[in-house]
Every structure is written in C-alpha cells, then in structure tokens.
C-alpha cells in the first residue's frame, strides 16, 4: 500500500501552501525506501537517494514556479511514481445566508470568504436549536443535525423543507479542501428571514365614469402557500407618468381604488407583499403595471358599491391576462369624500 | 438520555497539573458550544472558558488565561480542561456545561448553559 | 471581568413575589441580549431558569420572568413556593475573549 495518505481531490495530485515548506511522498515505493527525485522533463536531481528523506522530497519556502509535476525513482532507477504539486491556501469560513419566499421552507447560500485556489467543497446540514429546562433536560426531542440537500448538487445553495415558522435552526456550512476544512455556523429563524416573493398578475384598470380613478388587482405569489395558515399584507405604490415620487397605500385585501389619480394621465402602478403579523421583511415590488384613468363622464347617479363591480360597457385598460381574485373586504376609499370634489371637476 | 459526566478532579500540588474530562451523551455533542464553570467552597459560580462546536475559538477568564487550555474531541464527544501552575485559589468544584450558543452572520456569542454536569472536586494544597 | 453585581439576599412568604437584580455595564449586561439565571440549591448542579433575558426553556415554571432595563437585568420569583429557597446567579455574555461572566449571587429565603 502507498505511503502517500491521499488527500480529498484529483488522484495523484499533492497540496502546499504557498510560502511554507511542503512535503512531497512518493506513491510507489514503501515507507521509508530511499528514491531520487526529478521534476518532469528535467533531468537534474532534485533530491538524491542518501537524503537521509527516505520516500519524501521536502521544498522549503513554496512558491508557483514549484507547482507542476515530480517523478521519483527507487535505487535500481524504477518509477516510484509520479506527483503533481499544487499550491494554495487552507478553507476559510464561508460566507453564508439564508433567504425564505415562505412561511414552510427556506435556502441558505454561501460563497467562499478566500479563494483557496483548490479543489473545494461545501458539506451542509442543519439541526433545531432547543435550550433544555432543568427537569425536561433528561430527554432531548429529536433535533437532528439532518443533511441540507444541495439543490441541484455542486449549486453553493441548500434547502430546508417543512421548517417549523416559531423554531430556530443552526445551520452549518463547512468548506473542505485538501489542505483542511472551515466551518461557519449560522441561526436562522423562519420569522426573521421571511420575505415573500412579489405579488403577481397585478392589473390596472380605469373606473368608468371616473377620470380620477384607477382600479388595481393582484394575487398571491405562486411561491405561498396554497392554503395559507399566515395571510399576506400588501403595500401598493402609484405615480403619473413623469413624475419622480411614488404616493404608497396599505390596501386591506387584493385590490384597491385609487381616488386621487391624475386625470388622463398612465399611472404606474407595483405593489409589495409581507407577512400579515410583520415577521420578516417586505418583498420587492412587483414589476409595475400601468393604467390610464378613464375620460368618459359619470354616470348620472353614484351606483351602489355592488353595481360598481359590475362590468363596465367599455372595456377597460387591462396589464395582464390574469383574472383578479376578489377582495378580502369592501373598500370604503370607493364611496368617500373625496367622490364630490372629482364630481365637481368633471361637471364643469 | 442527555448528560455530560465529569472527571479527573483531585488533590493536587500548588504549581501541578491536573486534566479534567467530561464525557458527553444523549445529543450531537459537535454541534454545541460547551464550557467549564468553577465553584469555589461556599462561594458563588465563575466563568472559566468556553470553546466553539468546531474547536477553533476557545475564551478565559482572566484567572486561569495562560495557565488552563479548553479542547475537545469532537470524535470522542469529550471536552477536556488541561490546568497548569495550579494555585490554591483553583480549588472549586468544576462543572462541565452545553450552551447553544448564538451565532449570527458575523460571529457566534455565549448564550446560556442548559446542561450542566455533576461538577469534579479539585483541592490543590500541599 | 468584573462579576455582576447581584444582593447577597431576598426573601419572601409563600405565594409573595421576589425581584433580583443583575447590574452589570454596557459591555455586558447592557450590550448584549444574552443575560441568563440560574438556581441552585445546596449541593447540587446549577439549572437554567431563563435565557436572552426573557427566555424559559422547556420546563421551567412561568413563575419565573426575567426582564432588562439599560445595564440592570431582574429576575422575578411571582408565587413564591418552598422549594424556590436556593441560590440564584445571573450570567451574562462579557463582549470579549468570548468570554462570559456571572453574578455575585442571591440566596432566596421563603419565609
């Protein structure tokens, strides 16, 4: 058997660190043997047989122009082996996070804090944190460790699945490379990394009659769950054209008038999601939408709020295909006061 | 069963040296920070060291820095207390202890010790 | 590092509450949410009773509350019983040398 241990990485291959010395061990001969030592190609001895080194060649100080390839040969001139010298450094701890779209998983990524210049590699796992009270300390639940699955493999991203939301997990994130490895430990609470993804299939559409207003829908994004336990809030964001501020509401449900558009004007229009009770953070805003309030005149009498959802007789100025979901409640901005100052600027 | 087992306490010399194990069971012990907590008789608790889940980063309290070295092997799930220059004022009941631990995205911090082990009896006298 | 400073005593009658204080400084108390308590009676081990300032670990009665204010963390015993009569520390992270640090002590007496 070799008296070379091999390292994690390409068979054949031998690590140092650059600037101390490195040792190099002949992979063909048994411990001890003495063997001369060339680097390929070459043919001036590196290190002779009576080096009192047995099966090793050691380079003091390590630099670049040592990497390449060695050969070494026993007594009687037969090949002992062939070694690749490459140099680089120790793992350092990784630099890692860890994101949620949902209230039921979450991913961690990491990426190296030092190039190593090795062959590198990243294991993963998790556990639940629990802090034992005195007399419950004598039967620990089940709290791992359990792997964290790279998804898709060699990806510098790991997924938990069915996380519990009021739990929190320690993750571990350990870089391995031949030279040795480094771990960095992470706490991550579902609570504090939530942030959903973006509503989707936000539409805009003008309120006829109404040339101040502008209807906007949207849905859930897909990524939430389909029968949610945790319900969603929503900021939305609108502006004219051309103008730099955006004015921000907190719709009560899946739509919202606005009351104050500029008339004849395409609005922008996004909107934000984030968990109902606050955990996490906001979502990014979604991709905007626009919609131009309509030019028509007001129906002679302000309908009731169940005749204002009915369809109109001209279609209205639609962004996406996708149908809106109703609100989760009326909204009393509709019928407010500010419906006889927009009737007065359009009578007159 | 979750328990951490103390040993190798004992009647030592001023300026000997004595080695505390402790011998983990019952949880993933190279998941867990894990520290060592003095009691002098008739005297309140004190903080000796402390070492992370992976070994790489111990602390000390100014008391013993220099003369005590924290470690462990995780393989073996043991942590151990190496004492040096041992001094009359070492003499305590010595408490092995798990802690979670907090650990952000920049650093891990003590947190609290949950687990706490029998405790082993050093006397250093002549 | 200095130990935090606790009373040396408190004592109640059955049923009453007790408060211990903790008073450290801003590099540990006051800088950090890791104050933890301990009892311990005589003879025995030291138990976790409350961790992060406020936190109960499984198992322990919600008799016990922790609470902070700037470099002065409590303890509060509510429906004082006869076996809370023990020792209790405060402990707390140092904010250096990983280090860690606890307190002078309190010896709870039920009356």
């Known amino acids: 058997s070799s008296p070379c241990p091999q390292a994690w990485g390409p068979p054949g291959v031998q690590y140092g660190q650059p600037g101390r010395s490195v040792k190099l061990c002949c992979p063909g001969v048994t411990a001890g043997d003495p063997v001369s030592w060339f680097r390929d190609g070459e043919p001036k001895l590196l290190q002779g047989p009576d080096s009192g080194l047995g099966h090793e060649l050691v380079l003091a100080q390590a630099d670049s122009t040592d990497e390449g390839t060695y050969i070494c040969q026993t007594l009687d001139g037969a090949l002992g082996g062939t070694v690749t010298l490459q140099l680089g450094y120790p793992p350092a701890r990784p630099v890692v996070s860890c994101q949620a779209a949902d209230y039921e998983n979450f991913s961690c990524t990491w990426s190296p804090s030092q190039i190593s210049g090795l062959p590198t590699r990243y294991l993963t796992s998790y556990r639940k944190k629990t802090v034992l009270g005195a007399d419950s300390q004598r039967r620990s639940p089940s709290t791992g460790p359990w792997p964290c699955p790279q998804d898709p493999l060699g990806a510098a991203r790991c997924v938990v699945h069915g996380a519990e939301f009021w739990s929190q997990y320690r993750i571990n994130v350990t870089e391995v490379n031949p030279l040795g490895a480094s771990t960095r430990l992470l706490d991550v609470s579902l609570q504090s990394i939530l942030r959903p993804d973006p509503p989707q299939g936000l539409r805009v559409e003008s309120v006829p009659g109404y040339p101040r207003r502008l209807r906007a829908s949207w849905t859930y994004p897909a990524s939430w769950p389909c029968q949610p336990h945790f319900l969603l809030k929503f900021r939305l964001q609108y502006r004219p054209a051309q103008h730099p501020a955006w004015s921000t509401v907190e719709p009560a449900g899946l739509e919202e008038v606005i009351t104050d558009a500029v008339a004849g004007l395409p609005h922008a229009v996004r909107v934000s999601a984030r968990d109902f009770l606050d955990a996490g953070t906001w979502s990014t805003w979604s991709p905007e939408a626009w919609g131009t309030p309509s030019t028509g005149t007001i129906p002679k009498e302000i309908p009731a709020w169940g005749q204002l959802h009915t369809q109109p007789e001209v279609e209205p100025q639609v962004d996406s295909p996708a149908p809106p979901r109703p609100s989760l409640q009326p909204h009393p901005r509709l019928l407010d006061h500010r419906d006889s100052v927009e009737q007065v600027a359009v009578l007159a | 069963e979750v328990q951490l087992l103390e040993s190798g306490g004992g009647l030592v010399q001023p300026g000997g040296s004595l080695r505390l194990s402790c011998a983990a069971s019952?949880?993933?012990?190279?998941?867990?920070?894990m520290g060592w907590v003095r009691q002098a008789p008739g005297k309140g608790l004190e903080w000796v060291s402390y070492?992370?889940?992976?070994?790489?980063?111990?602390g000390y309290a100014d008391s013993v820095k220099g003369r005590f070295t924290i470690s462990r092997d995780n393989s073996k799930n043991t942590l151990y207390l190496q004492m040096h220059s041992l001094r009359a004022e070492d003499t305590a009941v010595y408490y092995c202890?798990?802690?979670?631990?907090?650990?952000?995205?920049?650093?891990?911090?003590?947190?609290?010790?949950?687990?706490w082990g029998q405790g082993t009896m050093v006397t250093v006298s002549s | 590092q200095s130990a935090l400073t606790q009373p040396p005593s408190a004592s109640g009658s059955p049923g009453q509450s007790v408060a211990i204080s903790c008073t450290g400084t801003?590099?540990?108390?006051?800088?950090?949410?890791?104050v933890s308590w301990y009892q311990q009676h005589p003879g025995k081990a030291p138990k976790l009773l409350i961790y992060e300032v406020t936190k109960r670990p499984s198992g322990v009665p919600d008799r016990f509350s922790g609470s902070k204010a700037g470099n002065t963390a409590s303890l509060t015993v509510s429906g004082l019983q006869a076996e809370d009569e023990a020792d209790y520390y405060c402990s707390s992270y140092g904010g250096s040398n990983n280090a860690g640090v606890f307190g002078t002590g309190t010896k709870v007496t039920v009356l």
């Open positions: 019952g949880f993933t012990f190279s998941w867990y920070f």
């Open positions: 070492i992370y889940p992976s070994g790489g980063s111990t």
């Open positions: 202890a798990r802690d979670e631990g907090y650990c952000s995205s920049t650093s891990c911090y003590f947190d609290a010790f949950d687990i």
């Open positions: 801003s590099s540990d108390v006051g800088g950090y949410n890791f």
